[in-house]
């Protein structure tokens, strides 16, 4: 990975692309913290495990964010 | 259309300083990193800065480092390039480049939009 | 730091013809940090290839981009006329650098 001890965030640019929650492999949803001072959402897809960085401002992946909690809520017993 | 247009370029003297801009429109500027890529007469492309979408990263390539600076005014839809200390090896045209969407140091996606360069000559 | 290298420097063929374009990294380089460059004379680069085998958008099939490791290929299925041009992969590297190889122009015949 190219990282290096200065890199402060990962995101180098954000995407306010809509994602189908059916072509996610995995959402994370890194906190603001002493190295990023900003939330990070990072989509892993499961079409060749392409990570895309995501707006956590736009409309359609705040909607992307709910979508998923309620679906790992029905998952959850 | 995603259009970049550089503008700053000219002849200067070895030593001298110039200021070089990149505007943006039609995509959100304020989403993107934004780069600058070189190309001496004849020669092939030199990467020389990038930015993060916020400004919250810079890094360059290490012949530059110390003497350029790269920053974004997202307000105003404009990448800079301040370059002191010129030399005649700085001699090229200057892109700008839009760095994908998405894009982070996990997969990188490309610099999928180019401005149509800027020339400056170091020396008489 | 890792160095890029093309070949061959130039290649010479006809239209309709394929082009088989190599780049290798002196060290390993994951596929997700490989990319392809179009460039004609007096024009600004062009995307053609993002993490060593996607295709950018606008970006016509007779492109295709593989390869892992230190040894990454560009090929041009069938050659057109306006594919005559050089062409530049780039490696996205730690620190983070983004480092271009030295290019090969594919030339008319």
């Known amino acids: 990975v190219p990282l290096s001890r200065t890199v402060r965030c990962t995101c180098i640019s954000i995407s306010n692309q809509p994602v189908n929650p059916r072509s996610l492999e995995k959402l994370e949803i890194i906190p603001a913290s002493q190295f990023c001072p900003r939330v990070e959402i990072i989509a892993t897809m499961k079409k060749k495990g392409e990570k895309r960085c995501l707006n956590p401002e736009s409309k359609a992946i705040k909607n992307l964010l709910k979508a998923v909690s309620k679906e790992r809520s029905k998952r959850s017993p | 259309q995603m259009q970049l247009v550089e503008s700053g370029g000219g002849v200067v003297q070895p030593g001298r300083s110039l200021r070089l801009s990149c505007t943006a429109s039609?995509?959100?500027?304020?989403?993107?990193?934004m780069h600058w890529v070189r190309q001496a007469p004849g020669k092939g492309l030199e990467w020389v800065a990038v930015?993060?979408?916020?400004?919250?990263?810079?890094f360059y390539v290490d012949s530059v480092k110390g003497r350029f600076t790269i920053s974004r005014d997202n307000s105003k839809n404009t990448l800079y390039l301040e370059m002191n200390s010129l030399r005649a090896e700085d001699t090229a045209i200057y892109y700008c480049?839009?760095?994908?969407?998405?894009?982070?140091?996990?997969?990188?996606?490309?610099?999928?939009?180019w401005g149509q360069g800027t020339t400056v000559t170091v020396g008489g | 730091e890792i160095v890029l290298t093309q070949s061959p420097g130039t290649l010479s063929l006809s239209p309709g013809e394929r082009a088989t374009l190599s780049c290798r990294a002196s060290?390993?380089?994951?596929?997700?940090?490989l990319a392809w460059y179009q460039q004609k004379p007096g024009q600004a680069p062009r995307l053609l290839i993002y993490?060593?085998?996607s295709r950018a958008t606008g970006i016509p099939d007779r492109f295709s981009g593989s390869g892992s490791g230190t040894d990454f290929t560009l090929t041009i299925s069938r050659l057109e006329p306006e594919d005559f041009a050089v062409y530049y992969c780039?490696?996205?590297?730690?620190?983070?650098?983004?480092?271009f190889g030295p290019g090969t122009k594919v030339d008319i015949k």
């Open positions: 060290q390993s380089v994951s596929s997700s940090y």
């Open positions: 930015i993060w979408f916020d400004g919250m990263n810079k």
């Open positions: 480049a839009r760095e994908g969407d998405g894009s982070g140091i996990y997969y990188y996606y490309g610099m999928d939009v």
């Open positions: 993490g060593a085998s």
């Open positions: 780039q490696q996205y590297g730690s620190s983070p650098i983004f480092t």
């Open positions: 039609g995509f959100t500027f304020s989403n993107n990193g």
